[in-house]
Amino acid sequence: AVNGTSQFTCFYNSRANISCVWSQDGALQDTSCQVHAWPDRRRWNQTCELLPVSQASWACNLILGAPDSQKLTTVDIVTLRVLCREGVRWRVMAIQDFKPFENLRLMAPISLQVVHVETHRCNISWEISQASHYFERHLEFEARTLSPGHTWEEAPLLTLKQKQEWICLETLTPDTQYEFQVRVKPLQGEFTTWSPWSQPLAFRTKPAALGKDT
């Protein structure tokens, strides 16, 4: 038997993936647990095996189809259950009626590249991955630049309040190594959260031109 409080949190990537984390305070012996997804309007159902990510939390990804296929809509509700094996039967440990488009977390932006770099500025572009057509242009981005001698946590956040897949970084120091990250969030959904940060893009500004003798 399992005692203690349980937390079951899931996010939809807007296409064909629901990622879930289940936390359980009480001790679980070597028990096999899984998440089961049962949509209210669709023919498919899906299961994934919960794997430990810490002493008291487990995670898994429900793969609903090909990465870019649209498997759920704004009208769908998915019953999500955590099931743990207890002897010969499965016990329901947690359950939620999951509204996918109220609980969005997109994939991290990809394909970051330097479009143009100068001494004091750098133009960077990126792409969004596996994002639903439902959003049209209703997305926002946050970006941050890592300067020498600083941490990511210290980097100021730059907010782009529209679907703009590029940025021009200004007031940079010449001949300096920087790193850049970006994340994305749909405007839709009560419990929607930011995507993970993209992989960092490293770039170096151009050296300042040498001053001429007078």
């Epitope: 209210d40 309007r41 669709r42 023919r43 296929s69 649209q70 809509t73 704004t74 009208v75 057509h133």
Partner: antibody, heavy 116, light 107 residues
Framework: QVQLVQSGAEVKKPGASVKVSCKAS????????ISWVRQAPGQGLEWMGD????????NYNEKLQGRVTMTVDTSTSTAYMELRSLRSDDTAVYYC?????????WGQGTLVTVSS | DIQMTQSPSSLSASVGDRVTITCQAS??????LNWYQQKPGKTLKLLIY???GLHTGVPSRFSGSGSGTDFTFTISSLQPEDIATYYC?????????FGQGTKLEIK
């Protein structure tokens, strides 16, 4: 096997109400949405709304301007559709259908005639 | 509301012919498109769900394809019992909407 059996034909006067029933069998009634669709004589199909028997949640087509109410009786596995303030252009065959990635099973239809 | 435009509205074909009906949505509906058959005086039958899924018991001569806004329904070899009206329907968003129908006749 899955079956949806609807109530018989009705003749109503303008301004009256009609309540059509749809009795389900052969599956777990509370696990699938039931939609109501109508078809005027010689015309196309219009989705009226749907209801989830497990919770009673409903969605209605705004074009029906609050004249429609969908209910269920889980004890008899029956869905109901009531349409109020009937007009002559409400004359149609009314269908219930189970939703499961499309409307996979349909009732036989109920003809509602609105005539003075 | 999403408008569904079906074409042609009617067509005549011979037994054994390949028959194609198209359906266009007024906005992107991904693959949330279904096809139905209605014979005169009868109720509707689901043939194809989610663009290309063949419903249980439906003969394999029926197929569907497409994505986004443009969809196609095909009968690979027309049989006499296929005489009916065919409808497309989107279940991408409420209110669900249907095409106006394609009436299929035998030459």
């Amino acid at each position: 096997q899955v079956q949806l059996v609807q109530s018989g034909a009705e003749v109503k006067k303008p301004g009256a109400s009609v309540k059509v029933s749809c009795k389900a069998s052969g599956y777990t009634f509370t696990s699938h949405w039931i939609s109501w669709v109508r078809q005027a004589p010689g015309q196309g199909l219009e989705w009226m709304g749907d209801i989830y028997p497990g919770s009673g949640n409903t969605n209605y087509n705004e074009k029906l301007q609050g004249r429609v109410t969908m209910t269920v009786d889980t004890s008899t596995s029956t869905a109901y559709m009531e349409l109020r303030s009937l007009r002559s252009d409400d004359t149609a065959v009314y269908y219930c259908a189970r939703e499961r990635g499309g409307f996979d099973y349909w009732g036989q239809g109920t003809l509602v005639t609105v005539s003075s | 509301d999403i408008q569904m435009t079906q074409s042609p509205s009617s067509l005549s074909a011979s037994v054994g012919d390949r028959v194609t009906i198209t359906c266009q949505a007024s906005q992107d509906i991904s693959n949330f498109l279904n096809w139905y058959q209605q014979k005169p005086g009868k109720t509707l039958k689901l043939l194809i769900y989610y663009t290309s899924g063949l419903h249980t018991g439906v003969p394999s001569r029926f197929s569907g394809s497409g994505s986004g806004t443009d969809f196609t329904f095909t009968i690979s070899s027309l049989q006499p019992e296929d005489i009916a009206t065919y409808y497309c329907q989107q279940d991408n968003n409420h209110p669900y909407t249907f095409g106006q129908g394609t009436k299929l006749e035998i030459k």
